[in-house]
Structure formats: structure tokens, C-alpha cells
Interface confidence: low
């Protein structure tokens, strides 16, 4: 209840996260032009990326374009990109939708289609659907430890969500263990009323809300966090212009002294940690 006699102050907060878990993925692996089936192991360094601010990202799905090299090649025949003669292709033109700079030539992409030749990382990325089910669907069982330090400078009071008495092997549960700061990703989605398996395909943004309602008076002191969860992105993927959450990154390597890269379009969940609340003291 609102204590009108108290002086209220908003929380100042810092957050640090640590994700743990191993995923195993069955996928086609291309080695020396030969495609083989392989099981790949993904650890924390493979599926998490450092983000600025109170966020962390877990990759749940991906599309790879392997063995790209900087050269000339036909661009991917996306809608409106096909040509029948050089006239359609403008030398030096950079179409924002294209993956390179046009050379002015119309060249065969395959047996039936021709597209403008581009100077780019080749072969250019194909427009592929995200694999379904998601390749790292087992990320549902990953856990995240959230360390949250808070401060009320006006009241000269500092605390954190992790208590010395906490068990490092606990897992957050709304009823049985509401103060545990280790969260299973699948449980976060369940609490938010969302289906992890479904969101993992295209990616999404999930909010972890930490609410501090602190009474700092010595006679009725209470200052512990309350956790809640909600999805922050537009879940209507069919209707939204760019569904889900994804970005591209590349792994570079040299083969016969030629720089090459593997382009990875990573789909996943960005977790935003939103800390709010007040501290009140007489």
C-alpha cells in the first residue's frame, strides 16, 4: 500500500547475465564440396552474443551461406530481380535489396533464369525459409543467471537479487522458488503464455521484468524483487512486415590464400531485462 509519509526514490540498476546450456544440431555439413550429415555441438560461445544494455541474445535457428568469396556472380533471383538482356542491368548500380554492385551484364543464374551480375560475396545468399522445427529448439532447456544490483542513492541503500543463502542449483518457479535468479528459458515463455518451439523458428523479443517495491524503514524493512515475463515483439508474424528477430554475421577464414566467409543468418530470442521500482523511507 502507498505510504504517503515516505520519501520515494526510483531504482538505479545494473544487470549482468550468464547463459548456460549445450545444444546438439543435426545438419548438412559441406566439406570440400561434399555435403555430409553431421551432428554439431553448440555451446555458449556459439549461440550467445554480447549485447549492449540490459539484453542478451540466444540463437535458436539459423540459415548458412557457406564458402562465399568476393567475386562476380549472378544475384539471387528474388522477385523483380530477373533480367532478359544487359539493358536491364545498370553498371555501378547498388540496389538496396541486392547483395552487391551491378556490373551491367545479364547472366544465367540457373538453367531457366537470368539475373544481373554483381560484384559481391558469392554465391549470393539465397532467400531461404528459417528451418522448421528450429535447429536449436533444445535451447528451451538452457538457463540464464540474472545478477541485478540496485541502488537508492538518496537513501544510501544498495542490495542485489542474489542472496548469500541462495542455492546455485535452484531454478525459478513462481510458486516454489520465486526468489531464485536462475531461469529456464522454456519456463520464461510458459510464464508469458508463449510457445517456445514456435517462437524459436523466426525469433522474437521477450521481456523479463524485475520489480523492486522497497520499504526501507527499519521497523518494516522489505526489499526483494518480483519477476514477471511478457513478449515484447509483434507475435502476429503473418501480419507483421518483418516477422521475428534475426541478424546476419560472418565467420571469415582463408582457403588457398583466398579470403572466404560463412554467412550466418541467426534467428533467436532477444531477452530484454526491464528493471523498475521505488524505494521508500520515512
Amino acid at each position: 500500500s502507498d505510504k504517503l509519509y515516505q520519501r520515494k526514490e526510483p531504482v538505479i540498476s545494473s544487470v549482468h547475465t550468464k547463459v548456460k546450456g549445450i545444444a546438439e544440431v543435426t545438419e548438412n555439413v559441406t566439406e570440400g564440396g561434399v555435403t555430409k550429415l553431421g551432428h554439431s555441438i553448440f555451446d555458449t560461445a556459439d549461440y550467445t552474443f554480447p549485447l549492449q544494455g540490459n539484453s542478451f541474445f540466444v540463437m535458436t535457428n539459423y540459415v548458412k551461406s557457406e564458402g562465399q568469396v568476393q567475386t562476380l556472380c549472378p544475384e539471387y533471383p528474388r522477385r523483380g530481380a530477373q533480367c532478359s538482356s544487359d539493358r536491364r542491368c545498370k553498371k555501378g548500380w547498388m540496389d538496396p535489396q541486392s547483395k552487391g554492385i551491378q556490373t551491367g551484364r545479364c547472366v544465367p543464374y540457373d538453367k531457366t533464369r537470368k539475373t544481373c551480375e554483381v560484384s559481391a560475396w558469392c554465391p549470393t545468399e539465397e532467400e531461404k525459409e528459417a528451418p522448421r522445427p528450429a535447429l536449436l529448439r533444445s535451447a528451451e532447456n538452457f538457463t540464464v543467471l540474472i545478477k541485478n544490483n540496485i541502488h537508492f542513492p538518496g537513501h544510501n541503500y544498495t542490495t542485489r537479487n542474489i542472496l548469500p543463502t541462495m542455492n546455485g542449483s535452484c531454478t525459478f518457479h513462481k510458486t516454489w522458488d520465486p526468489q531464485c535468479s536462475i531461469f529456464r528459458l522454456g519456463d520464461i515463455f510458459q510464464e508469458a503464455g508463449e510457445n517456445f518451439t514456435e517462437v524459436a523458428v523466426q525469433g522474437g523479443i521477450m521481456g523479463i521484468e524485475i520489480y523492486w517495491d522497497c520499504n526501507l524503514d527499519s521497523w518494516s524493512h522489505h526489499c526483494r524483487p518480483r519477476y514477471s515475463f511478457r513478449r515484447l515483439d509483434d507475435k502476429n508474424t503473418d501480419e507483421s512486415f518483418v516477422p521475428g528477430y534475426n541478424f546476419r554475421y560472418a565467420k571469415y577464414y582463408k582457403e588457398n590464400n583466398v579470403e572466404k566467409r560463412t554467412l550466418i543468418k541467426a534467428f533467436g530470442i532477444r531477452f530484454d531485462i526491464l528493471v523498475f521500482g521505488t524505494g521508500g523511507k520515512f
Partner: nanobody
Framework: EVQLVESGGGLVQAGGSLRLSCVVS??????MGWFRQAPGKEREFVAT????????YYGDSVKGRFTIFRDNAKNTVYLQMNSLKPEDTAVYYC?????????????????WGQGTQVTVSS
């Protein structure tokens, strides 16, 4: 000493089911696979499962009929064979691989069981 011991083979009518088991001792493998060899034919890939029991892959001829699963606690891999056909008649071998690459190729499997005979009569 590494040992892979298969069991569960036998004679079954077309359309019937069998479950093969393979108990592993002496080593833990990253990938476990089942292969089969019919008389006068080459050894053929059937199915593989990674360390994560959810992670499995099947040969085209058995997709939708066979299920591979793994119990890491018991060091056992199973092959549940449903809707069996006479062309499934073969000796079935269990194999273990320390590698997770190219798991449909028998070359990566370092350790093999003795095999168990499966006969499907029409």
C-alpha cells in the same frame, strides 16, 4: 574393452514390429547408429542418434517406420521397427562413433556389434 551387444532380432510377419537393443560398455560414443546388411548386398545406413536423444536421422527406406532412441543412463540405444516389410530382412548392426560428422557413413563408426538377424516373412 569396448563392447556393443545387440539383441531383439527374430522372425516376424510383414506388417509386424520388433525392437532391437544395443548395450554399450567400455566407452561413451557421441553418435550411435544402426546399419543393416541383406544377403549379397552392401551394408546400408538405417538410423543415427546423437548424444541428445532428440537428435536423430534416418535412411530414406525406413523414414516414418523406424524410430531410434537412446538411453544415456543405461548406455543403450534402441531401434523400434514398425510396419516391417520383407525387404527389411537383414543382419542389423549397432555401431558407435566418437565423431559427430558424416554420421550416415559407416567409415566414421569405429566400434561395431556382432549383429542380430531380422527376418520378415510375407
Amino acid at each position: 574393452e569396448v563392447q556393443l551387444v545387440e539383441s531383439g532380432g527374430g522372425l516376424v510377419q510383414a506388417g509386424g514390429s520388433l525392437r532391437l537393443s544395443c548395450v554399450v560398455s567400455g566407452r561413451t560414443f557421441s553418435a550411435m547408429g544402426w546399419f543393416r546388411q541383406a544377403p549379397g548386398k552392401e551394408r546400408e545406413f538405417v538410423a543415427t542418434v546423437g548424444w541428445n536423444p532428440m537428435n536423430s536421422y534416418y535412411g530414406d527406406s525406413v523414414k516414418g517406420r523406424f524410430t531410434i532412441f537412446r538411453d544415456n543412463a543405461k548406455n543403450t540405444v534402441y531401434l523400434q521397427m514398425n510396419s516391417l516389410k520383407p525387404e527389411d530382412t537383414a543382419v542389423y548392426y549397432c555401431a558407435g562413433s566418437g565423431s559427430l560428422l558424416d554420421v550416415t557413413s559407416e567409415a566414421v563408426y569405429t566400434d561395431w556389434g556382432q549383429g542380430t538377424q531380422v527376418t520378415v516373412s510375407s
